[in-house]
């Protein structure tokens, strides 16, 4: 997130520093489009991957286990609900739980940012050419860092599973079990400028199938790479920090225009797993009253 040396409140009667809001939104859009974009656009496939990785591409089965003793109907209802077929279809891709952190001064190879991530609150967008319509700062950056836009394919020899635990009054388990198909493409790690190693905890057996136009010296920017050990994960920003990082006051209500500026940051924070603590895969190591999901709001 950007850090500004300029005081926000005294300079902006409107309660929003629009320069900072635009620049911050653009930064988060660059992160997202670097990971999911291709050839100056966000393809349907890339958009689908983004939705999948933030967990809203399909209906998920949620198991709710309550700590208290009473057994009302709703406690077991979710286990018996019928779920739509698309939850189980085979075109699942691996849902990594590794951070996608970023540093604000990193020159990401940005992509075209079409108005797909956070649409305008007005309904009339019919007159816009989708190739021209980046919308409110969602624009098409050039390749400043000189890195080619290469995606890696991943082959997996086993079913992969991501389990997020939120342990509180009631324990909620969101289980997503997905099988990546060989040759499927994964988004790039925006933060890695040197070849990182594959994490030892990764359940992907190997990385393969690099595009032939990728230079030998270029780092592979696969979705499954662990972050470099000397880098910090992107901070989990709560509501106040999200607002101030966009040059917005925290005492005034948001209108739709102002909220629109925040959308890429919110999506990027979800996608980067910024607010998830990655606990050990051994369930026994999770203390009964700790949170693997930080309270961000």
């Amino acid at each position: 997130f950007p850090q500004t040396t300029e005081k926000i409140s005294p300079n902006w009667e409107s309660g929003i520093n629009v320069d900072l809001a635009i620049s911050t939104r653009q930064y988060h859009l660059q992160q997202l489009f670097y990971r999911y974009g291709e050839n100056n656009s966000l393809s349907v496939e890339g958009f689908r991957k983004l939705l999948q990785n933030i967990g809203i591409d399909k209906i998920k089965r949620i198991h709710i286990h309550h700590d208290h003793d009473h057994h009302s109907d709703h406690e077991h209802h979710s286990d018996h609900e019928r779920h739509s077929d698309h939850e189980h279809h085979s075109e699942h891709e691996h849902h990594s739980d590794h951070d996608h952190h970023s540093h604000h001064n990193h020159a990401a190879s940005g992509k075209n940012k079409r108005k797909a991530l956070c649409p305008d609150h007005d309904s009339d967008s019919s007159g816009k050419d989708p190739r021209n319509s980046q919308g409110k700062g969602a624009h098409r950056p050039e390749h400043a860092s000189g890195r080619r836009n290469v995606k890696d394919s991943v082959s997996a020899s086993e079913v992969t599973s991501t389990v997020y635990n939120t342990v509180s009054e009631g324990t909620h388990f969101l289980e997503t079990i997905e099988t990546p198909r060989p040759g499927k493409l994964f988004p790039k790690d925006v933060s890695s400028s040197t070849p990182p190693s594959v994490t030892s905890k990764s359940r992907v057996s190997r990385l393969a199938g690099r595009k032939t136009n990728e230079s030998v010296s270029e780092p592979r920017k696969g979705f499954m790479y662990s972050r470099n050990t000397n880098e910090n994960p992107q901070e989990c920003f709560n509501a106040s920090k999200l607002l101030t990082s966009h040059g917005m006051g925290i005492q005034v209500p948001l209108n739709a225009t102002e909220f629109n500026y925040l959308c890429p940051a919110i999506i990027n924070q979800i996608d980067a797993r910024s607010c998830l603590i990655h606990t050990s895969e051994k369930k026994a190591e999770i203390p009964p009253k700790t949170y693997s999901l930080q309270i961000a709001w």
Epitope: E6, T24, Q30, N105, D122, K128, Q134, K136
Partner: antibody, heavy 113, light 107 residues
Amino acid sequence: QVQLKQSGPGLVQPSQSLSITCTVSGFSLTSYGVHWVRQSPGKGLEWLGVIWTGGTTDYNAAFKSRLSISKDNSKSQVFFKMNSLQANDTAIYYCARGPSSYWGQGTLVTVSA
Amino acid sequence: DIVMTQSQKFMSTSVGDRVSVTCKASQNVDTNVVWYQQKPGQSPKALIHSTSYRYSGVPDRFTGSGSGTDFTLTISNVQSEDLAEYFCQQYNNYPWTFGGGTKLEIK
């Protein structure tokens, strides 16, 4: 106090390149994008391009082939270079933190032999 | 590119009057419009952003309105120091584009 100060030549020969440096103070280039705009009597105000916080750039397609914007965050400087100038590129060139009131003082560039 | 049209190149008004400068976008730009005031020999000064948000230090006699394609800058109780050229600009789509300007003359 937010300021943008421009330095660059006032006269450029036809077919030569124009280089302008915009030195900013009161804010960080890692937090704000810096835009370039020019103004001429014939064409009014034209947005030329921007360099974003991470170093990526967006250019007006009409100028993309001959325009380059770069920066040095540590020196708080943004560098503007336009190649192959012609007489109709005569204008006042501004750097700005746009879309705000924070604009440079402008550099009047005359393209003439 | 989005064309921002300010149909009136010149407007004449008197001190104390109310005047409205209009700007029309060739396609929807939501509320992403800035109004600038430029006095001779000076850089443009932003008055309004996001169609209706007044910048700090801008007198409250300047108000902005509109959405989509039609936008208006209204100056109520015009003062002699308001003699200037006024530009609209959209920042919804790149390239950002400006209106041709409206020069306000004081009778």
